[in-house]
Interface confidence: low
């Protein structure tokens, strides 16, 4: 026997309470496939979430963030804090990175310096709070009489700022 | 001192249900999100969901989807779960925990002390 | 929903040894991984977050690492006090899953 409610549209929800009818989804409720027996409330964007897609009978909002946050999660479910390039963001807020370390972006943690000196290379230009140290030829290669930028102090280990 | 007092063990019957309290103190309710963690005897631990007071929005564990219910009151900072069509497999302890919302890294930085629930007949 | 598994599920340690216990995500969760640690009878209380950084009161014999889907926590000098259960959290997507736990006890 075919289950009546297998009838049923995505936007629409198998009444119960109604002999199985089926009733357009509620303002503020969506069901995005057929056959279904509820239909489920509708994603609210507030505070720091923004709309980016409004909610219809068929499909959820979706959020993202309001400037000076980012989407964090899947479908965006948290916001994080913006921090400027060169820091990272801690339970006190934005901090700068200790030195050793960068973040070239304004989400995500500091993280320390490439080591040029693991690929045989020379430090061609020196590490920033904001940017990567860049690795050059090996000593090797170059030309007698040739300097190099002086490398730069060992990276901290991940994990030390302040907290 | 932020605290999360949840309320006192439970022993219900098969197919019954029960609400689970978790009421928040020393900071602001609606800026973090109240997590469910679910730790049956001798276990590990599984997520349940998250609600945020704010708005009430919520995320499920697909495998609790029919088992629970969050919701909150935000007039006592007070965030509940109701566990529905109670089985066997539902006696465990059951911990709220929060995460704020601006910062992830914050996550399940305060633990209530625990609600024990025992199903039995 | 990503995978945590965690090894070993128990470990008998000597006091003073240093003991790691790793974690794998069946994906990659960006650092985005929490360690617990488990007393009898009490809430998880939470050591490490974002992979390496130390919860705020936690000794400094504790630390995380790895980065992708690998993660190790490392107690460099096991005490009394720390015999527990650790899990491991990650939380880059949701649902947030855990490890099955290690159970850690003095030889």
């Known amino acids: 026997l075919q289950d009546p409610c297998s009838n049923c549209p995505a936007g629409t929800f198998c009444d119960n309470n109604r002999n199985q009818i089926c009733s357009p989804c509620p303002p503020n409720s969506f069901s995005s496939a057929g056959g279904q027996r509820t239909c489920d409330i509708c994603r609210q964007c507030k505070g720091v979430f923004r709309t980016r897609k409004e909610c219809s009978s068929t499909s959820n909002a979706e959020c993202d963030c309001t400037p000076g946050f980012h989407c964090l999660g899947a479908g965006c479910s948290m916001c994080e804090q913006d921090c400027k390039q060169g820091q990272e963001l801690t339970k006190k807020g934005c901090k700068d990175c200790c030195f050793g370390t960068f973040n070239d972006q304004k989400r995500g943690i500091c993280r320390p310096w490439t080591n040029c000196s693991l690929d045989g290379k020379s430090v061609l230009v020196n590490g920033t709070k904001e940017r990567d140290v860049v690795c050059g030829p090996s000593p090797a290669d170059l030309s007698p009489g040739a300097s190099s930028v002086t490398p730069p102090a060992p990276a901290r280990e991940p994990g030390h700022s302040p907290q | 001192q932020v605290q999360l007092v949840q309320s006192g063990a439970e022993v219900k019957k098969p197919g019954s249900s029960v609400k689970l309290s978790c009421k928040a103190s020393?900071?602001?309710?609606?800026?973090?999100?109240i997590n469910w963690v679910k730790q049956a005897p001798g276990q590990g631990l599984e997520w349940i969901g998250n609600?945020?007071?704010?708005?009430?929005?919520?995320n499920y564990n697909q495998k609790f989807k029919d088992k629970a219910t969050l919701t909150v009151d935000k007039s006592t900072s007070t965030a509940y779960m109701e566990l529905s069509s109670l089985r066997s497999e539902d006696t465990a302890v059951y911990y709220c925990?929060?995460?704020?919302?601006?910062?992830?890294?914050?996550?399940?930085?305060?633990w209530g002390q625990g609600t024990t629930l025992t199903v039995s007949s | 929903d990503i995978q945590m598994t965690q090894s070993p599920s128990s470990l008998s340690a000597s006091l003073g040894e240093r003991v790691t216990i790793t974690c794998k995500a069946s994906?990659?969760?960006?650092?985005?991984l929490s360690w617990f640690q488990q007393k009898p009878g009490k809430a998880p209380k939470t050591l490490i977050y974002?992979?390496?950084r130390l919860v705020d009161g936690v000794p400094s014999r504790f630390s995380g690492s790895g980065s992708g889907q690998d993660y190790t926590l490392t107690i460099s000098s096991l005490q009394p006090e720390d015999i527990a259960t650790y899990y491991c959290?990650?939380?880059?997507?949701?649902?947030?899953?855990f490890g099955g736990g290690t159970k850690l006890e003095i030889k």
């Open positions: 974002r992979a390496n």
């Open positions: 609600i945020y007071p704010s708005d009430s929005y919520t």
């Open positions: 925990t929060r995460t704020w919302e601006f910062y992830y890294d914050s996550v399940f930085d305060y």
């Open positions: 020393g900071y602001t309710f609606s800026s973090y999100w």
């Open positions: 994906q990659d969760i960006n650092s985005y």
């Open positions: 959290l990650q939380y880059d997507e949701l649902p947030p899953t």
